[in-house]
């Protein structure tokens, strides 16, 4: 089956959610791990990741269609220390499949705002830190 990984971001007030979404077949969930790395150009692994999610096969989901699993990493307040390059990755211990999402970046600006760039088209996000609004 076709397995792919996408990265996205959303804001709720001052919180920034970084989301790694893996699309896979139901039976492929077992043994799959999704993880998010920062500033790891070559050695992004579950061990060096900021957060990881081990997928489990959900017997409650009927059919053999494609399903999605999400890892969400929430930053309560973005600070200059969060500036850097992030990447969503996944791997299967069963099949040996390795997935690497596109690199995306958080840039904290001198005005106290931050931008998230490198996401899918129409997902260049610019956030005003103090007001907590999407501009």
């Amino acid at each position: 089956g076709c397995i792919n990984i996408t990265s996205s971001a959303s804001q709720e007030g001052t919180r920034l959610n970084l989301i790694c979404t893996v699309w896979h077949k139901k039976e492929e969930a077992e043994g799959f791990v999704v993880f998010l790395c920062k500033d790891r150009s070559g050695d992004c692994s579950p061990e060096t990741s900021l957060k990881q999610l081990r997928l489990k096969r959900d017997p409650g989901i009927d059919g053999v269609g494609e399903i999605s699993s999400q890892l969400m990493f929430t930053i309560s307040q973005v600070t200059p220390l969060h500036s850097g390059t992030y990447q969503c990755c996944a791997r299967s211990q069963k099949s040996g499949i390795r997935l690497q999402g596109h690199f995306f970046s958080i840039l904290f600006t001198e005005t106290g705002n931050y931008t998230v760039t490198g996401l899918k088209q129409r997902q260049h996000l610019e956030f005003s830190h103090n007001e907590g609004t999407l501009s």
Partner: antibody, heavy 119, light 107 residues
């Protein structure tokens, strides 16, 4: 178990230098931004400096800018604070602390290193 | 720079008493964190993001507030709660600031 162990403190004359070290263990050091927080005798806490996980970005409180330098060696799981042109008001216990990645709280602290600046 | 003012500076409470420590910010902040420090020991994160208890903190503690006014409350004071409590916030560009601390003693 997360452990942060500071060393390098001591008595130093005004205008002199001192370098503090903080040896970290029990977590993936290279993933975390680190900080130094100080506490003058019988006083409150004061943030001194922070460094990004990769070491490329550093931040300081105004009173130490140009005098103190924070750095780290991820291969040695150690962060440092080089303190130059020390003043009597820098006398304090200096704590090494980790930045929680998802929040702005300092979640792990070392036992502290005592620095006394006096002639 | 945002200034955090804690009150009272010192207070004493009897076992079983309800205690409230307040932290006022000179400008609005998004979250407040609280630390507990006992003599000769390092500070410990106690309450983070205004109301979340750190691991191992008894549920007699609670935190609340918004804007410029935040508080830490102990519902039934116990001897082991005697310590100094500090509030802390993050804001750009002043970065990390702490309150001067509230010393809580047991009667």
């Amino acid at each position: 178990e997360v452990q942060l162990v500071e060393s390098g403190g001591g008595l130093v004359q005004p205008g002199r230098s001192l370098k503090l070290s903080c040896a970290a263990s029990g977590f993936t050091f290279s993933n975390y931004a680190m900080a130094w927080v100080r506490q003058a005798p019988t006083k409150g806490l004061e943030w001194v400096a922070s460094i990004s996980s990769g070491g490329g970005d550093t931040y300081y409180r105004d009173s130490v800018k140009g005098r103190f330098t924070i750095s780290r060696d991820n291969s040695k799981n150690t962060q440092y604070l080089q303190m130059d042109s020390l003043r009597s008001e820098d006398t304090a216990t200096y704590y090494c602390a980790t930045h929680n990645y998802e929040s702005t709280v300092f979640d792990y602290w070392g036992q502290g290193a005592s620095v006394t600046v006096s002639s | 720079e945002i200034v955090l003012t804690q009150s009272p500076t010192t207070t004493a409470a009897s076992p079983g008493e309800r205690v409230t420590i307040t932290c006022r910010a000179s400008s609005s902040v998004s979250y407040m964190h609280w630390y507990q420090q006992k003599p000769g020991a390092s500070p410990k994160p106690w309450i983070y993001e205004t109301s979340k208890l750190a691991s191992g903190v008894p549920d007699r503690f609670s935190g609340s507030g918004s804007g410029t006014s935040y508080s830490l409350t102990i519902n039934n004071m116990e001897a082991e709660d005697a310590a100094t409590y500090y509030c802390q916030q993050w804001n750009y560009p002043s970065m990390y600031t702490f309150g001067a601390g509230t010393k809580l003693e047991i009667k």
